[in-house]
Interface confidence: medium
Amino acid sequence: DPRVRLEVQESVTVQEGLCVLVPCTFFHPVPYHTRNSPVHGYWFREGAIVSLDSPVATNKLDQEVREETQGRFRLLGDPSRNNCSLSIVDARRRDNGSYFFRMEKGSTKYSYKSTQLSVHVTDLTHRPQILIPGALDPDHSKNLTCSVPWACEQGTPPIFSWMSAAPTSLGLRTTHSSVLIITPRPQDHGTNLTCQVKFPGAGVTTERTIQLNVSYASQNPRTDIFLGDGSGKQGVVQGAIGGAGVTVLLALCLCLIFFTVKTHRRKAARTAVGRIDTHPATGPTSSKHQKKSKLHGATETSGCSGTTLTVEMDEELHYASLNFHGMNPSEDTSTEYSEVRTQ
């Protein structure tokens, strides 16, 4: 029957950690008496036995889906409107393969096995962009922005890590970007600054490193943008398919970040932007649902230089971790944890 048809592209390519929306429409005439029955749609891996195997995505609420695709593969289209569009977020290598669509409406059940979708997951070649607004003058603070505009909002939010020898603190954080407040010193000229972005949903990391150009001479204002490469569109479908991202304000001074360090002699001073739950009577909050970031640190520091910052973004909790390079924790120091919750 020429009326039984599914239209979807033969193959789609997506970079690891990113996402893609594959448009799809289908048609199957159904017996008139079933016209008011709900339409259920399913995407299965090639070779699946529909009566035994779980689909990778479906709109049927009580239907289990494959564990490895749960929350990442979604039947975004409305099958009652003949839409079988498939969304994939946090693409992983093991997602490589072919998939077929199945529709069920009343007694009509049909698997479109002759028109399958082939998914190709390739290396993440995109790199972060680093934006420096104007010249870097010694002892003057500047906001550097590391962004991944090619990432999509539906995926697991990325983790941004900054590495620099210069004095720094954290500024605004959005789904796609992180701001580093840098106050360079003359000796920081020519040193490296790295922004590393990890996509936890797929476990892939990408980074960009630039050399700081700190000059005494006041120059005309300029903006340097260090763009990610590999943004060619050779058949690669890239992310950003609508959806809601979480925007977080996390202004965190490294010198004053709140952490608890047990020592035999003293406790470090505690300050933080945002709200901090430490529950003094019991120590820092602990829950199996809450990840912790260790604050690797000695009992006190005199400056904010030589640090690595990591900012993670979660549904409710936001974390910062500090690595104080070249400093070993005191032998008698044990580290406890803090949580930074934004309001």
């Epitope: 048809r5 008139y32 008496h33 003949n82």
Partner: antibody, heavy 119, light 106 residues
Framework: QVELVQSGAEVKKPGSSVKVSCKAS????????ISWVRQAPGQGLEWMGR????????NYAQKFQGRVTITADKSTYTAYMELSSLRSEDTAVYYC????????????WGRGTLVTVSS | DIQLTQSPSSLSASVGDRVTITCRAS??????LAWYQQKPGKAPKFMIY???SLESGVPSRFSGSGSGTDFTLTISSLQPEDFATYYC????????FGQGTKLEIK
């Protein structure tokens, strides 16, 4: 409640073409086919052809093959029927009808568009 | 194409009468048949599908039967609003209509 709203009456010269529209008001026709059926004055019903908008797939009755073109605009939920090389015997009321199942039943009809072919 | 022949072409009856209209297909069409009612100046109205299934909203005095080549539409007790022209339609092969049966008041 879905309604099929058709364009107004037309008077055409022999040899010319006519294009009649049919808009699904208050709903979509994505899950359906839209057929065109005509009825000459005092005569019975005659099926001309159909389109399945979601597939952009049309097929026609043998009698009208080559003279009728049925199209659809999915964004506006509107179907069109164009009949060319008009002759006086094409004078009729042209109905659009929604086909609601695996076997083509016309469960919803437009009110009809009178096309008069006269020199 | 499959031809559908309705009989009679016209029929006079009174309110309360039981009326039967037949539709014969030139070849077997299983139960792929529908019935429509049309009043003057109006579009046809869908009444019966699958030869015997009543469309929602259609009064139960209407019924359909048959399969293969011979089909009937029965109105058990005619009401004033039932006087109209009735068409059968098949879709087993392409789509064709019967020539219609005009039901008039006696």
């Amino acid at each position: 409640q879905v309604e099929l709203v058709q364009s107004g009456a037309e008077v055409k010269k022999p040899g010319s073409s006519v294009k009649v529209s049919c808009k699904a008001s208050g709903g979509t026709f994505s899950s359906y086919a839209i057929s065109w059926v005509r009825q000459a004055p005092g005569q019975g019903l005659e099926w001309m052809g159909r389109i399945i908008p979601i597939l952009d797939m049309a097929n026609y009755a043998q009698k009208f093959q080559g003279r009728v073109t049925i199209t659809a605009d999915k964004s506006t939920y509107t179907a069109y029927m164009e009949l060319s090389s008009l002759r006086s015997e094409d004078t009729a009321v042209y109905y659009c009808a929604r086909e609601g199942g695996v076997d083509w039943y016309f469960d919803l009809w437009g009110r009809g568009t009178l096309v008069t072919v006269s020199s | 194409d499959i031809q559908l022949t309705q009989s009679p072409s016209s029929l006079s009856a009174s309110v309360g009468d039981r009326v039967t209209i037949t539709c014969r297909a030139s070849q077997g069409i299983s139960s792929a048949l529908a019935w429509y009612q049309q009043k003057p100046g109006k579009a046809p109205k869908f009444m019966i599908y699958d030869a015997s299934s009543l469309e929602s909203g259609v009064p139960s005095r209407f019924s359909g039967s048959g399969s293969g080549t011979d089909f009937t539409l029965t109105i058990s007790s005619l009401q004033p609003e039932d006087f109209a022209t009735y068409y059968c339609q098949q879709f087993n092969s392409s789509i064709t209509f019967g020539q219609g049966t005009k039901l008039e008041i006696k």
